[in-house]
Each structure stands twice: as structure tokens, then as C-alpha cells.
Interface confidence: low
């Protein structure tokens, strides 16, 4: 650059015919220098009839500017387009508080045109960023927040992120969020959320990746309904009958808390005993009857059967015959005979 | 030959000042940065300061901010560093070198002595 | 601050390769272009790499330099050491405010 270069240029031009102002076609756009590769700034302008780059509100010296000229079939009018070549070198060589920039200015003999200015800066992707985000264990339908602040980087670095390598893409995924800060949100973790997330900034530098975020989505333990109450585990007197509950309700995950409580209630029971019956002492035989029979009984009383016990296995009531008392015959003896 | 000749170094007290030169010769100055470095006795290489082709620009270590002055005359092609309030610290070999980022050309060096 | 580190010193025999590592304290190192200067006692420095790996002409291939960006460190190779590789080498780049930051040196010996 020169600040001689000014001198060059006409101050007053031909009084030509009315020209419309110079209006541009291409403006120069915004660029970065990576690492050591120049960049090309551009621009075209119609009509003109000169047109040359100012770069810090210096004029860029003509020898650099490669312009090429050409007239518009269909408006008659000239065309001029203009390119320069802008190195690391010169922008590191630029101090102050305003960035390196460029702009085009057209002339035609209506007057001059500027273009916007287009900056050129020199890119680069710090390596730490300035948050990472941090792994978490949440509960299943929780929300998550994975934050993630990239490193400082000119131009300012896209983020995406990855869960298990793969790239998050929230329109096919409705459960995931990007915010405008960069953070991640679940919106309610689900089992297969349980995944390492990796906030990835990339600019036209480099490609940076964060720490491993891993988040868990676990699952509390939830009981199942009681089981009915046993039957009172002692055929006779005290015992206890129980229920039965088990954890599978759902059952705990990737470290979820396991049931509170008991899986076992016992209550007390008191099954009353079976009593056997038992005869009572045959009574005495009674006189011998006008059939010649005489007889003797028992009860099954002694104690009578309670409770389930077993009924008293025998006779009731025991005859046999007899021939004293008030038989009138005499007969001959016979078996026992048993009347019920 | 690309050459860069120093001079103007020596002993000075403690607050007083100094100027040292720097002649260039076997190129067009006026093309390039130009930077001073030091390096005092037994140490390493530390930076000054450097100014731009056409004087517009220049930037110094904090260390020497507001005492050292850069400068430049192009019809000379010659360097300066103007050196007041000088300290015991400021000792050391001051070498001029070409460009301001990457120096390609360095001057043979002159020695500072601060010390009363 | 922007710090470059280098080690102190480093040692081989003649014929064998060095390499001398320059690490950035902050930001990244990659950012910005890194030279390398050679010291021997009594003179003063020459370029031997500019430009991160670029070599001034009459430095021999025996130097390279490169840029790790995942450790944040330059490297200057000096393969087939001879012994007029004996000498101090600094390595530098620039801070954010384009101050011009030297590494501490190291010493480069041959056995």
C-alpha cells in the first residue's frame, strides 16, 4: 500500500455524456486467511470507468489490482471488474481497533460509488473450549441440560453435537433441543438416551471436540402388588402366614435405586388343635329283658371330637343274650349282637 | 550484501537515557519492518519492539512501554531506539533485526550497560 | 500472559536425530506462524525455519519445523546432527496483542 497512490487518481474527469452512477454487480464479500494462504478480494462495478480498492482508507497501489474491462451488450455500458490479493501479513500489519477491511470504489462520470466494506481476518479455533459439558445421571422422563461453550474463534465456530459419534439432528429427533447458546436439552430422557455426548466446534480452521459427557438414564425400582396371604404355616396352634412382593415393577436400571421396604409381611395365626373323640366307660349291663337280651352302651364324649378330630372307632351299644331276669325262655346263646 | 550495522551502546546510570542506531544497507528499507530484540548476560532472547515500513504502526514489550521509543528515517535507512529512564534490568545485547513478526536479518548487536 | 516453553537442553551424538519442542501456554499455536533461531556463543541469531516449516535458503534439510496442534507445540527437527549444530535455539510466534514472544532457548549439545 501507498499513500502516494491517491495522486494517481484523476481528480476531475470529461464532461461525457450523463452517465448513470456506478452501481456494483459483485461487492466485496467478508474473507479469512487460514494459516499462510492469501485471499482474493473482488468486485465489479457498471458503468465505470475506473475502479480500485481502498483497504484501511489507504488506496491499494494500482500494480496490485488485476481489473479486467469488458462493455455490456445488452445496456452499452462499462463494466469493470477488480481483484486484489490480501496476505496474513498485511492484516497482522494493521493496529488499532478496527479489524482489516477493504472496500471498491467506482467512478464514471457521474461520480464515485463505494461498496460496503468487506473485513478480512485472520481465522483461527483456540483449542480449549470455554465450557465442556459435564455427564449426568437422571432419571428416566427427566429433562437434561449438556452445556457447551465453544472456543473463541474468528469466524465464530458452528457446534454440533454427537451422541455416540453420531450427529444429533433435532428435526429427526423431537426429544432433543439445541439452544441458541449451544446447550443441549433432553427434553425427556428415555433408556436410550443412555449415551456419551460429545459437543463438536468447527470453523474453516479446524474441528475441535469436547470431553465425553456420559449420560446415564436410570431407572428406580418399583414394587410389584402383594402376592394373597398364606395359609397359617402350623397345622395346630401358633404360626404365621405371609405375603410376598419382588422389585420387577420396574425392575431397577443402569443404577437405579432398588425398592425401599419389605418384600416379605408376616402376620400371626392361631390354628385351634384337632381333638379325637373318646368313649366313655361302658355303663353296666342291664337286666336281662323279656326277649332275653340284655345291653350296655357308651358315648363318644370323653372328649367328644372337636375341631376337626377323628370320631371314636367302635361300638355304640353292646348286647348279648341272657336267661335270668324277666326272659321267659330259655334260649340258646348267641353271638353278640350290635345295636346302632 | 544484506547488512545490518549498530551502533550507540555503553554505560549509563541508572535514570539516564540512550540512543541506539541501527544502518541498513543491501536492501530497500522502506519495504520492511525493522525490530529490536535483547538479550541480557546469560539469558534468553526477549522481544522490544518493532515499527512498521512507513512509521505508522509500532508496538512495544510491556516492560519498556512509555521509556523506549522506536523510530525510523527512511531516507537514511536507519533504525533508532530511543532509551530513557533506563533500570538495572534494561542491561543487556540490544540487536536490530529485520521484519516484524519473522526478523531474517539481524545486526551484529551493541552492549547496554545500566549501572551506577 | 502468552508463554512459550521449550526444554532446557538437549544432548545426542553425531549423526543421530534432536527434536526441540516449543509448547504455547494459552489459545492455540496453530493460530499463528512460529520461526526458529539459531544462537551460537558470541553471535547473534539466524533464521534457520520461518513460517511454522518454511527454510531461508542456505539452511541445510537437516531442518524442519512443524506444528502438533493437539499438543499445542512446535517442533524443530535437526536430523544427521553435526557438530556445528552446537548452539542455542528459540523458537517464536506472537501474542494476541502481536507482541513478539521468544521461547526460553534450549541448549543443543553434541556428544
Known amino acids: 500500500q501507498d499513500d502516494d497512490f491517491f495522486h494517481e487518481l484523476p481528480e476531475t474527469f470529461p464532461s461525457d455524456p450523463p452517465e448513470p452512477l456506478p452501481h456494483f454487480l459483485i461487492e466485496p464479500e467478508e474473507a479469512y486467511i487460514v494459516k499462510n494462504k492469501p485471499v482474493n478480494l473482488y468486485c465489479k462495478a457498471s458503468p465505470a470507468t475506473q475502479i480500485y480498492f481502498k483497504c484501511n482508507s489507504e488506496w491499494v497501489h494500482q500494480k496490485d489490482h488485476i481489473v479486467d474491462e469488458r462493455v455490456d451488450e445488452t445496456s452499452g455500458l462499462i463494466v469493470r471488474e477488480v481483484s486484489i490479493e490480501i496476505s496474513r501479513q498485511q492484516v497482522e500489519e494493521l493496529f488499532g481497533p478496527e479489524d482489516y477491511w477493504c472496500q471498491c470504489v467506482a467512478w464514471s462520470s457521474a461520480g464515485t460509488t463505494k461498496s460496503r466494506k468487506a473485513y478480512v481476518r485472520i481465522a483461527y479455533l483456540r483449542k480449549t473450549f470455554e465450557q465442556e459439558p459435564l455427564g449426568k445421571e437422571v432419571s428416566l422422563e427427566q429433562e437434561v441440560l449438556l452445556q457447551c461453550r465453544p472456543p473463541e474463534g474468528i469466524p465464530v465456530a458452528e457446534v454440533e453435537w454427537l451422541k455416540n459419534e453420531d450427529i444429533i439432528d433435532p428435526v429427526e429427533d423431537r426429544n432433543f433441543y439445541i439452544t441458541i447458546d449451544h446447550n443441549l436439552i433432553i427434553k425427556q430422557a428415555r433408556l436410550s438416551d443412555t449415551a456419551n455426548y460429545t459437543c463438536v466446534a468447527k470453523n474453516i480452521v479446524a474441528k475441535r471436540k469436547s470431553t465425553t459427557a456420559t449420560v446415564i438414564v436410570y431407572v428406580n425400582g418399583g414394587w410389584s402388588t402383594w402376592t394373597e396371604w398364606s395359609v397359617c404355616n402350623s397345622r395346630c396352634g401358633r404360626g404365621y402366614q405371609k405375603r410376598t412382593r419382588t422389585c420387577t415393577n420396574p425392575a431397577p436400571l443402569n443404577g437405579g435405586a432398588f425398592c425401599e421396604g419389605q418384600s416379605v409381611q408376616k402376620i400371626a395365626c392361631t390354628t385351634l388343635c384337632p381333638v379325637d373323640g373318646r368313649w366313655t366307660p361302658w355303663s353296666k349291663w342291664s337286666t336281662c329283658g323279656t326277649e332275653c337280651t340284655h345291653w350296655r352302651r357308651r358315648e363318644c364324649t370323653a372328649p367328644a371330637p372337636k375341631n376337626g378330630g377323628k370320631d371314636c372307632d367302635g361300638l355304640v351299644l353292646q348286647s348279648k343274650n341272657c336267661t335270668d331276669g324277666l326272659c321267659m325262655q330259655t334260649a340258646p346263646d348267641s353271638d353278640d349282637v350290635a345295636l346302632y | 550484501q544484506v547488512q545490518l550495522q549498530q551502533s550507540g551502546g555503553g554505560l549509563v546510570k541508572p535514570g539516564g537515557s540512550l540512543r541506539l542506531s541501527c544502518a541498513a544497507s543491501?536492501?530497500?528499507?522502506?519495504?520492511?519492518?525493522m525490530s529490536w530484540i535483547r538479550q541480557a548476560p546469560g539469558k534468553g532472547l526477549e522481544w522490544v519492539s518493532y515499527?512498521?515500513?512507513?512509521?505508522?504502526?509500532?508496538n512495544y514489550a510491556d516492560s519498556v512501554k512509555g521509556r523506549f521509543t522506536i523510530s525510523r528515517d527512511n531516507a537514511k535507512n536507519s533504525l533508532y531506539l530511543q532509551m530513557n529512564s533506563l533500570r538495572a534490568e534494561d542491561t543487556a545485547v540490544y540487536y536490530c533485526?529485520?521484519?516484524?513478526?519473522?526478523?531474517?536479518?539481524w545486526g551484529q548487536g551493541t552492549m547496554v550497560t545500566v549501572s551506577s | 500472559n502468552f508463554m512459550l516453553t521449550q526444554p532446557h537442553s538437549v544432548s545426542e551424538s553425531p549423526g543421530k536425530t534432536v527434536t526441540i519442542s516449543c509448547t504455547g501456554s494459552?489459545?492455540?499455536?496453530?493460530?499463528?506462524?512460529v520461526q526458529w533461531y539459531q544462537q551460537r556463543p558470541g553471535s547473534a541469531p539466524t533464521t534457520v525455519i520461518y513460517?511454522?516449516?518454511?527454510?531461508p535458503s542456505g539452511v541445510p534439510d537437516r531442518f524442519s519445523g512443524s506444528i502438533d496442534s493437539s499438543s499445542n507445540s512446535a517442533s524443530l527437527t535437526i536430523s544427521g546432527l553435526k557438530t556445528e549444530d552446537e548452539a542455542d535455539y528459540y523458537c517464536?510466534?506472537?501474542?494476541?496483542?502481536?507482541?513478539?514472544?521468544f521461547g526460553g532457548g534450549t541448549k543443543v549439545t553434541v556428544l
Open positions: 533485526a529485520r521484519g516484524g513478526g519473522g526478523m531474517d536479518v
Open positions: 517464536q510466534s506472537y501474542d494476541s496483542s502481536n507482541h513478539v514472544v
Open positions: 515499527i512498521s515500513s512507513s512509521s505508522s504502526y509500532t
Open positions: 543491501g536492501f530497500t528499507f522502506s519495504d520492511y519492518y
Open positions: 513460517e511454522d516449516n518454511q527454510r
Open positions: 494459552s489459545g492455540s499455536i496453530a493460530s499463528n506462524y
